[in-house]
């Protein structure tokens, strides 16, 4: 703190502001009377230097002219960037005890002259907003620097307003308040920036402009569409717009896309037909205005509209799959199952779905209608029937589809040949095969049908399928696929009457099982064991299970176990093996195998044979 | 009732300094925009400075650099400083009060709503 400088004064030459790199003479005198009270030349003035509050120097080396007892001259060079304090002391060097006592001070500032302003860009935002420029004002001058923004305009006039910068605030925009009015869209006007502080100033160079350049238009407003007779693809979509809009820009896209449609309009007075709309689908719109053709600036976009278009009749073919199983000798259960439309294909929330079933011959005729993607029904073995499916929104029906019911696995001669399935990843399977050898008629199609081999999967799951055109011979399977899990996988080819299959199991990843299987019983029939066993629990097989392994070997034995490696068949649960000695008493167990490896052995079992050997 | 009065005008040798004043009743000075215009005899009333509600002055290039307008919103008073003096500049200085944001309509008298009686500036070369 500095006492109101009571005891003396400090002057500044040349003066208290000065540019980076000169020097300052700082001089200190004490007023009349004031001093040490015993001896005047006793009186030592010292010059302390502060910045952030904090001494930094004692300038007691930096005098170069000094009235003893009376005023002292400092001389201080390379100050820094801002504002350096002086405060000059007055040390009584007699009293070794008293502290100096503080004289007055003054504050130096250190800068530079701004440097012209550059880069000025003025906006008006709406035709009833204000004008705002901004500009870059160069370098930090360190300084008070005060701005002036001068806009000139038609009829002689000029507009001014000022803003500064220090070390407290930044001036490098300016908000004039005042608005440019449309009457005046063929005006020119000038605006300048001026920057003034204690060691110099300077003037941007002037840029020039028209109303039409600067005048953002506000964003459009109160967006809403009208659908044409409830139309799900045609619809006007109309806004509110300032006056002097000439040219609209026009986005949308459903809601789930990543690329918007555009459209240009011009001169469209808030309202715009859209013809290409995709029925039952939530879309966005947005625009954007522009107050000249060629000149001036976009608006922001204006606020989302997000609308769902109205449903319209679905279109497309619902893909039909079917399972035949006779029930009895007159009976068979017909399940026919098809897949959901595509949103671009339903076009509205499908209500139901109308299935028939026709007898060809006798003309009769089932009929209904379900919500589900499935149907079953129990008919007569006999005759040629054929199947329709076709789906219904709130706006009308699909085309119905139809698929004759044949015999699907009936004619070996239509069975491909050289089926195989290989896993390409974690989700998918690769299945290819050859056309069949002997056909008695053209194949139309293929259909790879598949389902997990787990228990009550036929009757609990629905199957998957693919429909391949008669010229390809393989399928990338991927639905419902899950690595680890073994699938039946059916190769069907279809005529116009007759259907042949050829069968395989796939995994799209696979492990060593977790377990081996369980041994359940070993019975002796006519000099050959049959080991019998339970299957390995679905979720412990982890892919498909190649083959089963018997080991056996005489208890107490350290040989290595002789073994018996079985084809896997799921219907299969017991093997005959024929090679053990009588009287002998066995250890037996099993592994199963698959493409990754062999399971660890299922539960030990001891048997002693006691007929014949062989 | 909104009343706005001028004070300050007089006699003035060319080259000489003014300062007119405007006090205003019934509204607040900072929320319109001020304005100065002056008519000179057998001429029309014509435009002279403005300061807008946000503190941008507008001023006719003709008096730019001897002219300037100031607000003092404690006073409710607006103030026209006039520095070289020409005997050109001799007319009746009318304050003028009105809510404007255009930067024409800052110069047009007809968007101005209050208007003082005038106080009177003369210049002898």
């Known amino acids: 703190n500095i006492d109101v400088c009571k005891l003396g004064t400090v002057t500044v030459q040349p003066a208290p502001v000065i540019p980076l790199g000169s020097a300052a003479n700082i001089s200190c005198s004490l007023n009349p009377k004031q001093g040490c009270s015993h001896y005047p030349s006793s009186n030592e003035l010292i010059l302390l230097k502060f910045v952030n509050d904090v001494l930094v120097e004692n300038l007691h080396g930096k005098k170069v002219h000094d009235h003893t007892g009376h005023s002292s001259t400092f001389q201080v060079t390379n100050l820094s960037l801002g504002m350096t304090l002086f405060v000059c002391k007055l040390n009584c060097s007699n009293s070794q005890k008293k502290p100096p006592v503080p004289v007055c001070g003054v504050e130096i500032s250190v800068g530079v002259a701004p440097e012209p302003p550059q880069n000025i860009s003025c906006v008006q935002e709406g035709e009833n907003g204000t004008v705002a420029c901004s500009w870059n004002s160069g370098k930090v001058t360190y300084l008070k620097t005060n701005y002036t923004l001068q806009l000139s305009g038609p009829n002689n006039l000029t507009c001014q307003k000022q803003c500064f910068s220090d070390n407290r605030q930044n001036c490098n925009r300016l908000d004039l308040g005042i608005n440019l009015s449309p009457d005046l869209a063929e005006s020119r006007f000038i605006v300048r920036v001026t920057a003034i502080n204690d060691l110099g100033n300077s003037s941007s160079l002037p840029h020039t402009f028209t109303f039409l350049d600067i005048v953002i238009p506000l964003p459009p407003w109160d967006i809403r569409i009208n659908f044409l007779n409830a139309s799900g693809s045609r619809g006007t979509l109309q806004w509110e717009d300032e006056g002097q809009v000439v040219l609209n820009q026009l986005r949308y896209q459903p809601l789930n896309s990543t690329s918007w449609n555009m459209v240009n309009a011009t001169n469209a007075k808030g309202k715009y037909d859209l013809r290409d709309l995709r029925p039952f689908t939530e879309y966005e719109f947005q625009i954007s205005s522009k107050l000249h053709l060629s000149g001036g600036s976009w608006s922001n976009w204006s606020e989302s509209l997000r609308t769902r278009t109205p449903e319209e009749e679905p279109v497309g073919i619902l893909d039909i799959w079917y399972m035949k199983q006779d029930i009895d000798y007159d009976r068979q259960q017909i399940s026919l199952f098809w897949k959901s439309l595509n949103p671009s294909e339903a076009r509205g929330k499908i209500l139901h779905y109308q299935v028939t079933l026709q007898e060809v011959t006798k003309k009769t005729t089932l009929q209904n209608t379900t919500r589900h993607t499935s149907w079953t029904r129990v008919i007569p073995r006999t005759g040629a029937w054929t199947a329709s499916v076709s789906a219904a929104n709130s706006k009308g029906a699909s085309a119905p589809t139809h698929i004759n019911i044949v015999d699907l696995c009936g004619t070996g001669l239509l069975a491909p040949h050289q089926v195989s399935a290989k896993s390409e990843n974690m989700d998918n399977i690769l299945v290819t095969w050859q056309p069949p050898k002997k056909a008695d008629s053209a194949v139309r199609e293929y259909i790879v049908e598949w389902r997990a081999l787990q228990p009550g999967s036929i009757t609990k799951f629905p199957p998957h399928w693919l429909r391949i055109p008669p010229d390809n011979m393989s399928a990338l399977i991927s639905e419902n696929i899950k690595p680890y899990i073994c699938y039946e996988i059916r190769v069907h080819a279809l005529s116009e009457s007759q259907g042949g299959c050829s069968s395989i199991r796939g995994d799209s990843k696979h492990k060593a099982p977790v377990s081996g299987p369980h041994i359940t019983a070993i019975t002796e029939k006519k000099e050959r064991l049959f080991i019998s066993w339970t299957h390995i629990p679905f979720p412990e097989q982890r892919g498909c299970i190649l083959h089963y392994r018997i080991y056996w070997k005489e208890r107490d034995s350290t040989a290595q176990p002789e073994l018996c490696e079985i084809q896997y068949r799921r219907s299969q649960n017991s093997h005959p093996i024929s090679s053990l000695q009588p009287r002998v008493t066995y250890v037996l167990w099993m592994t199963a195998v698959t493409a990754a490896g062999e399971s660890p052995q299922g539960n030990e079992r001891e048997f002693c044979p006691q007929g014949k050997a062989n | 009732q909104v009343q706005l009065q001028e004070s300050g005008g007089g006699s003035v040798q060319a080259g000489g300094s003014l300062r007119l004043s405007c006090a205003v009743s019934g509204r607040t000075v900072s929320d319109y925009a001020m304005g100065w215009f002056r008519q000179a005899p057998g001429k029309e009333r014509e435009f002279v400075v403005a300061?807008?509600?946000?503190?941008?002055?507008v001023y006719t290039n003709s008096v730019k650099g001897r002219i300037t307008i100031s607000r003092d919103n404690a006073k409710n008073a607006v103030y026209l400083q006039m520095n070289a003096l020409k005997p050109e500049d001799t007319a009746v200085y009318y304050c003028s009060m009105g809510p404007i944001t255009t930067f024409q309509g800052l110069a047009r008298q007809n968007e101005y709503h209050y208007w003082g009686q005038g106080t009177q500036v003369t210049v002898s070369s």
């Open positions: 300061m807008s509600s946000s503190e941008t002055t």
